[in-house]
Amino acid sequence: NADGLKEPLSFHVTWIASFYNHSWKQNLVSGWLSDLQTHTWDSNSSTIVFLCPWSRGNFSNEEWKELETLFRIRTIRSFEGIRRYAHELQFEYPFEIQVTGGCELHSGKVSGSFLQLAYQGSDFVSFQNNSWLPYPVAGNMAKHFCKVLNQNQHENDITHNLLSDTCPRFILGLLDAGKAHLQRQVKPEAWLSHGPSPGPGHLQLVCHVSGFYPKPVWVMWMRGEQEQQGTQRGDILPSADGTWYLRATLEVAAGEAADLSCRVKHSSLEGQDIVLYWEHHSSVG
């Protein structure tokens, strides 16, 4: 993908609300372009915080001001509504509500939108077309919640419009505004270390790869040209500077480490793979 982000691309907003008791609650709101956080919500000032210079996309100040107003109104309304109906819905304190909503892009075209709400980490209700529907597994509580949510058609009209119209327009503008940043290529650094000993006479070899962008990367322990199937890839983890980190480990008998190497392929390397040989590495870590 030219934008350095894997298809399908999505923009989504997440709202995590923790209800500790009837009067004490907390919430976290964030906006994401695929796995890159682009926005956060400052509850104290009821303002959207733009985390990247291009996070405004092509929306005007007036549009942002209106979106801020809607988020403020809806956060207050949602908290109040959930608090009011908690007993009726058999929500037991402390509980957590997670909401994620946004839209997806396939080959530069909007392919759909989504809005889901989870209660205590389980699917509860979702927004389809122009109304809320319960997840069948969520039972009668979810059905009742939908009945409450669907009482206000104006609310649903705004929600539908945000998902079907505002979000698709925004993601396209965001990709355009962030093009230079998203299309950048940052070369990885790699180094080798010992991991914790897996047992007597065995070694854990660790290949660290850090500071690369975009995210797709190939890392493998090799013996000559032979890929070592025992290679364990960790999760690709985010770094504070917007690049990525990954470690790949391999367990081997102590005498079999000598001719092993770690090979790293990444788009920024333009075919010039990084190859690090275990026998050359100095004992660090």
């Epitope: 209106e66 809607l70 058609q153 104006h154 009209d157 419009n161 119209d165 505002t166």
Partner: antibody, heavy 123, light 107 residues
Framework: EVQLVESGGGLVQPGGSLRLSCAAS????????MTWVRQAPGKGLEWVAF??????????ESNPAVKGRFTISRDNAKNSLYLQMNSLRAEDTAVYYC??????????????WGQGTLVTVSS | DIQMTQSPSSLSASVGDRVTITCLAS??????LAWYQQKPGKAPKLLIY???RLKEGVPSRFSGSGSGTDYTLTISSLQPEDFATYYC?????????FGQGTKLEIK
């Protein structure tokens, strides 16, 4: 620049019909809900009806006071909004305004208004 | 339908005065309130939305406040061009409803 221009008002007898038009320009018409609001002489404002945008499937919503008598519609090719008024009553006498929200989000906060067209229902 | 009750219905004030107009909704409208200014023979003009957000281009002497069912429009220092009729409007639920208006006149 957003422009809304109403036309079609006039004098009509009780029980009669009239069709109002609103010509829109300066924005992508299909992205917006479009609304009619009226104001009886010397009285306050009253929301009449709206028609949703493309994302909303161009469906309509109207005030119970006019439901069944007034029909809102749009011609997207002509960037035009209409209000077909049937079975008119004396209490429908008002200036009819065409209005639009600030952005494409149907907040109900009307930032753009036409100049209005006067409908008088009298025998 | 949500009823919107504005008070006072008319008000006499002088240039430089601080003026307050209130709007009472028949149920909680969660900040979903707009204020409009209308001059004779003209269309209404949006001043405030979301209860307290000033529309771009509107002078900062206008401010909105309130929550729940009670909302207020304040003009901190009246200017000659502010003499007009003011309306509140709820857009919390359909049908949208307006207050009956407050006519602000020169004393």
């Amino acid at each position: 620049e957003v422009q809304l221009v109403e036309s079609g008002g006039g004098l009509v007898q009780p029980g009669g019909s009239l069709r109002l038009s609103c010509a829109a320009s300066g924005f992508t018409f299909t992205d917006h809900y479009m609304t009619w609001v009226r104001q009886a002489p010397g009285k306050g404002l009253e929301w009449v009806a709206f028609i949703r945008n493309k994302a909303g499937g161009y469906t309509t919503e109207s005030n119970p006071a006019v439901k069944g008598r007034f029909t809102i519609s749009r011609d997207n090719a002509k960037n035009s909004l209409y209000l077909q008024m049937n079975s008119l009553r004396a209490e429908d006498t008002a200036v009819y305004y065409c209005a639009r929200e600030t952005t494409g989000i149907p907040t109900g906060w009307f930032a753009y208004w036409g100049q209005g067209t006067l409908v008088t229902v009298s025998s | 339908d949500i009823q919107m009750t504005q008070s006072p219905s008319s008000l006499s004030a002088s240039v430089g005065d601080r003026v307050t107009i209130t709007c009472l909704a028949s149920e909680d409208i969660y900040f979903d309130l707009a204020w409009y200014q209308q001059k004779p023979g003209k269309a209404p003009k949006l001043l405030i939305y979301g209860g307290d957000r000033l529309k771009e281009g509107v002078p900062s002497r206008f401010s909105g406040s309130g929550s729940g069912t009670d909302y207020t429009l304040t003009i901190s220092s009246l200017q000659p061009e502010d003499f007009a009729t003011y309306y509140c409007q709820q857009s919390y639920s359909y049908p949208y409803t307006f207050g009956q208006g407050t006519k602000l006149e020169i004393k």
